[in-house]
Amino acid sequence: VPRWRQQWSGPGTTKRFPETVLARCVKYTEIHPEMRHVDCQSVWDAFKGAFISKHPCNITEEDYQPLMKLGTQTVPCNKILLWSRIKDLAHQFTQVQRDMFTLEDTLLGYLADDLTWCGEFNTSKINYQSCPDWRKDCSNNPVSVFWKTVSRRFAEAACDVVHVMLNGSRSKIFDKNSTFGSVEVHNLQPEKVQTLEAWVIHGGREDSRDLCQDPTIKELESIISKRNIQFSCKNIYRPDKFLQCVKNPEDSSCTSEI
């Protein structure tokens, strides 16, 4: 008789999840010599251990501590780029501006980027059929708890000027319910972080509004100021030109406003 399986509302574990995690770990350690000491088999074992045989609505940050320990990494604390709802452009930026880092440029963020995973209570199986949805099922699911854990640690590590890229095409440019709004903002350390600088990325080519005056940006400014961190904001009117100018800063057209 087939055993009853919980049907969750979200997509199941990414196909070939173990293969992808291991391959990404190996690749990351080959690209980043300072992480060459990392044993990718141990990393996978710790990753697996965080959610296998556990109820996928009952995952805690504590479950991920062995993985966090193995993935400990020092990134320059003054070169951190946070993002919200504009991941691709943030990644394109750090691929050009090699001295800046998003969370997904760190080992643990790189391993999990775009992946979904969950297990089942009391069995060693990975659930490839469905996983809990944050809204419809539960917030303490393996994926959400992972990102909350690594995002908190990443924000806590930041210092000096921290940059955040925000999507100016969204109705809520700053969303209190995003990972940035609910985790990272509240874990920046005022004794280390001097300024949070927001880059608001415009979507439309003819959009010349000052989106730094948007009510949600004012809300972000208020939250940050109350935490004794300075706030500044820049409009990025032409993201394509912005990237081009990061690549070729000496280009004559890069002196004008982007």
Epitope: E19, T20, A23, V26, K27, E30, Q41, H91, Q95, D114
Partner: antibody, heavy 117, light 107 residues
Framework: QVQLVESGGGVVQPGRSLRLSCAAS????????MHWVRQAPGKGLEWVAV????????YYADSVKGRFTISGDNSKNTLYLQMNSLRAEDTAVYYC??????????WGQGTLVTVSS | AIQMTQSPSSLSASVGDRVTITCRAS??????LGWYQQKPGKAPKLLIY???SLQSGVPSRFSGSGSGTDFTLTISGLQPEDSATYYC?????????FGQGTKVEIK
């Protein structure tokens, strides 16, 4: 310099077995992910299998899972592909390749496997 | 598995021409993409890794660009020895998948 040399190809009947070898030299064999990639006549490239450096993790394409086994002998610097229950659609040139930084940076010259009755 | 779609499937160009081959992924793959050149009867050869990094020993007329879903291999001044089939490969999500290839012929 890095060299990969495959051997063991040939003509085999459907349902039979064959073992391919890939002799590696010029690098520390046990420090890299080693892969098999194949190419059917006149067709494109298809990934077949990988074994990670310590040999504890082996993964396969769906098309060969349960029939093919990848293995490595670090003392001989040699990669193997044991192919059982061969089918006509397994006819291809089989390449071994080293993976570094997510790319196949070195390839062998290939060995042709023909499955025909 | 992630699908990689190359275009065109074949092209013919003259020596000295600028040739562009594109590869589109069925989902975002950051910059986890390589380009390979294969001549008839030979093994493939790595040209570009991480979307835009030139493999050592590869002529500088080859360049790669792109991120996310759209990638380009450019040969800035086509040479007779560049007659070959070119493949893209993603390794963002396992297993690695190749594009179907672009055959480049010299006019």
């Amino acid at each position: 310099q890095v060299q990969l040399v495959e051997s063991g190809g040939g003509v085999v009947q459907p349902g039979r077995s064959l073992r391919l070898s890939c002799a590696a030299s010029g690098f520390t064999f046990s420090s890299y992910g080693m892969h098999w990639v194949r190419q059917a006549p006149g067709k494109g490239l298809e990934w077949v299998a990988v074994i990670w450096y310590d040999g504890s993790n082996k993964y396969y394409a769906d098309s060969v899972k349960g029939r093919f086994t990848i293995s490595g002998d670090n003392s001989k610097n040699t990669l193997y592909l044991q192919m059982n229950s061969l089918r006509a659609e397994d006819t291809a040139v089989y390449y071994c390749a080293r993976m570094f930084r997510g790319a196949f940076d070195y390839w062998g010259q290939g060995t042709l496997v023909t499955v025909s009755s | 598995a992630i699908q990689m779609t190359q275009s065109p499937s074949s092209l013919s160009a003259s020596v000295g021409d600028r040739v562009t081959i594109t590869c589109r992924a069925s989902q975002g793959i950051r910059n986890d993409l390589g380009w390979y050149q294969q001549k008839p009867g030979k093994a493939p050869k790595l040209l570009i890794y991480a979307a835009s990094s030139l493999q050592s020993g590869v002529p500088s007329r080859f360049s790669g660009s792109g991120s996310g879903t759209d990638f380009t291999l450019t040969i800035s001044g086509l040479q007779p020895e560049d007659s070959a089939t070119y493949y893209c490969l993603q390794d963002y999500i396992y297993y690695p998948t190749f594009g179907q290839g672009t055959k480049v012929e010299i006019k």
